[in-house]
Each structure stands twice: as C-alpha cells, then as structure tokens.
C-alpha cells in the first residue's frame, strides 16, 4: 500500500528573466527513492538518480541547473515557461508518486509565491 505524500511548492509565480526553484518532498513513507524525474507536460527536463547523479535534457541544458537536493532550478524564465511541472518519484517498493507544480511567469515585477499544498 502506498502511504506516502508529496509536498510541493504548489502554485508559484516568478518574473520573466528570473529563476525559480522547483521543489518536491516525499514524506510519510519508508520507501527508498531511487530517482526523481522532472517533467513539463510532454517534455522531460531532468532526471536525478539517487546513485548515478543527474541527466539534463539537452533542450534545457542551458536553462536548468540541478538541485538544490532533488529539486530543479529553472533559469532565464520566459512567458512560455508558464505551465504545469511534475516531479515523479520512483520508489522501492511503493512505486511512483507524482507531485504537481504550476508556474506562472509574469511580465510584471510582482511575483508572489503560492502556499504549499499536498498531493496524497
């Protein structure tokens, strides 16, 4: 039975040209995290394997930095970066847990961070 929950940074906003940290945290399970995949709708951004390190997709390599931790830093944001991002935790023996983050990239200099929320 999958008992874990993923806590994410929730709905967040950031300024065009700036950067943002996408962060998820898996709790309430003793399952071992083998890797975390970061995806944006249909695209793979990066993979962090707990043992083998990071894979950064070539189409994002100039704008994505690994970390902190299992998180991902998106840089040089554009309005086109607005949308859903998913952290997919591959765990043993539980299986897969998915967290969702919605990022809005604003033209304006007013960019507020949304509250954290949990996905069971």
């Amino acid at each position: 039975m999958m008992t874990g929950t993923i806590e994410t940074t929730g709905n967040i906003s950031a300024e065009k040209g700036g950067s943002i940290i996408l962060q998820c945290h898996l709790s309430s399970t003793t399952a071992q995290v083998t890797q975390v995949n970061w995806e944006q709708q249909d695209q793979l951004l990066a993979i962090c394997n707990a043992d083998l390190g990071w894979h950064i997709s070539p189409s994002f390599k100039d704008r994505v930095a690994p970390g902190p931790g299992l998180g991902l830093t998106l840089q040089s944001l554009t309005v086109n970066d607005t949308g859903e991002y998913f952290c997919i935790y591959h765990t043993y023996p539980d299986g897969t847990y998915t967290g969702r983050i919605f990022l809005e990239v604003l033209e304006s200099s007013v960019a507020e961070h949304g509250a954290r929320f949990q996905i069971p």
């Epitope: 083998t34 995806e39 993979i47 043992d51």
Partner: antibody, heavy 119, light 107 residues
Framework: QVQLVQSGAEVKKPGASVKVSCKAS????????MHWVRQAPGQRLEWIGG????????SYSQKFQGRATLTVDTSASTAYMELSSLRSEDTAVYYC????????????WGQGTTVTVSS | DIQMTQSPSSLSASVGDRVTITCQAS??????LAWYQQKPGKAPKLLIY???YRYTGVPSRFSGSGSGTDFTFTISSLQPEDIATYYC?????????FGGGTKLEIK
C-alpha cells in the same frame, strides 16, 4: 582522448566468481558514472548496473542485485565488476561504458571482456 | 521493467537507400532514448542521444525522432560502412533496457 581499457578474457567454472577491471584515461574519472553492460552470444545488450565514482553510489538491475558488485578505485581511475555464483548463462562479453557528463547515454565503451563459464 | 521492442529484427537494403528502424517502449519514456551502432566483434558506438540529438562526429545521414513510446532511427542514404546492428536504449528509469537490435545488411 577518452579510453576505457578492460582486462583480458576469463574462463570460469560454474559457481565461481569473476572480476573484470576497466581502466579509464583521458578524462576526470569522478565526473562520469561508469556502467557495465553484457551481451550473451546472439542476444541483446543487458544493463547490469552503474556506479558513481564520486561517491561510490551504485544502482543495479534487480536481476543482478546480490550477485554483481561494482566498485571503483579512484586513485587508479579503475572500475571493477565482480559477478559471483557463475552459471553457463553468464557466458557473455562484458563491457564497461561511461555515461556522458550530465546525461545518461553511454558515450564511451571498453573493448569488451569475454567471460566463458564452462565445466 | 520497461520493455523495448525494436523492428524489424533484420533488414536488407541497397547502398543509397533510406533505411528506417523503429523502437517502441512499453511505457512513456519522454525522450530518454539513445541509439547505438555495433559492428561484429566491436563495442557499441553512440549515434543519437535524447531521441533526436546527433552525437559528436556522427554523419548527418543518421537521425532520430520520436517521444513518448514511439521512436524512429533513420539512415537517409545507406553507405557500405553502415552495415552493423543497431540498438535503442531507454534510460528513463532503472533498470536501463535495450531493444533486441536490428541487423542491417547490404542487398
């Protein structure tokens, strides 16, 4: 230039162990994970596992968990793969191969080591 | 484990022909796919990474495309030196797995 040079062919009896080495040169050894892939005669390539020389973290295919052991000697820029409890089905060519910097594709390969298991 | 199904398993073509090999993953792997060329008695060589990026020094006649579960590897104009077995490889999640290979021969 990057080179991965493996140890020579081995003939082993069923139940024995084999340890294959892979000496890396031409790059910073700790910056790329090292993987082991085998190919039995006429078969597809099969991933055994990988090791991160930076922290000795290992990831194994479940099929080889407990039977394969991956290690590194960073001072000698050498990776090792030990396979125990050998059986005839383990007869194969064993390759060491490194993954690209910040990517998981396998960009350089050793020349292969033939391991024959026969009574 | 993710199964990789490659087709055809063998194919015969003439010099100058356009050759297409397909690889199907048993689940969505986004673009976490590479293609390798292996000649008899030799180690594999990386040709294409992340589904569509040509590796350094690989001739432009080799290309890859696809995302999700369906991928294609193409040789636009077959050359005699392209005779080899070609493999796809997924690294979306461990254990990493390979296709069964496509053996390419000259007619």
């Amino acid at each position: 230039q990057v080179q991965l040079v493996q140890s020579g062919a081995e003939v082993k009896k069923p139940g024995a162990s084999v340890k294959v080495s892979c000496k890396a040169s031409g790059y910073t050894f700790t910056e790329n994970a090292m993987h082991w892939v085998r190919q039995a005669p006429g078969q597809r390539l099969e991933w055994i596992g990988g090791i991160n020389p930076n922290n000795a973290g290992t990831s194994y295919s479940q099929k080889f968990q407990g039977r394969a052991t991956l290690t590194v000697d960073t001072s000698a820029s050498t990776a090792y793969m030990e396979l125990s409890s050998l059986r005839s089905e383990d007869t194969a060519v064993y390759y060491c191969t490194r993954s690209s910097y910040y990517r998981y594709d396998l960009d350089y390969w050793g020349q292969g080591t033939t391991v024959t298991v026969s009574s | 484990d993710i199964q990789m199904t490659q087709s055809p398993s063998s194919l015969s073509a003439s010099v100058g022909d356009r050759v297409t090999i397909t690889c199907q993953a048993s689940q969505d792997i986004k673009t976490a796919l590479a293609w390798y060329q292996q000649k008899p008695g030799k180690a594999p060589k990386l040709l294409i990474y992340s589904a569509s990026y040509r590796y350094t020094g690989v001739p432009s006649r080799f290309s890859g495309s696809g995302s999700g579960t369906d991928f294609t590897f193409t040789i636009s104009s077959l050359q005699p030196e392209d005779i080899a077995t070609y493999y796809c490889h997924q690294h979306y999640t461990t254990p990493w797995t390979f296709g069964g290979g496509t053996k390419l021969e000259i007619k």
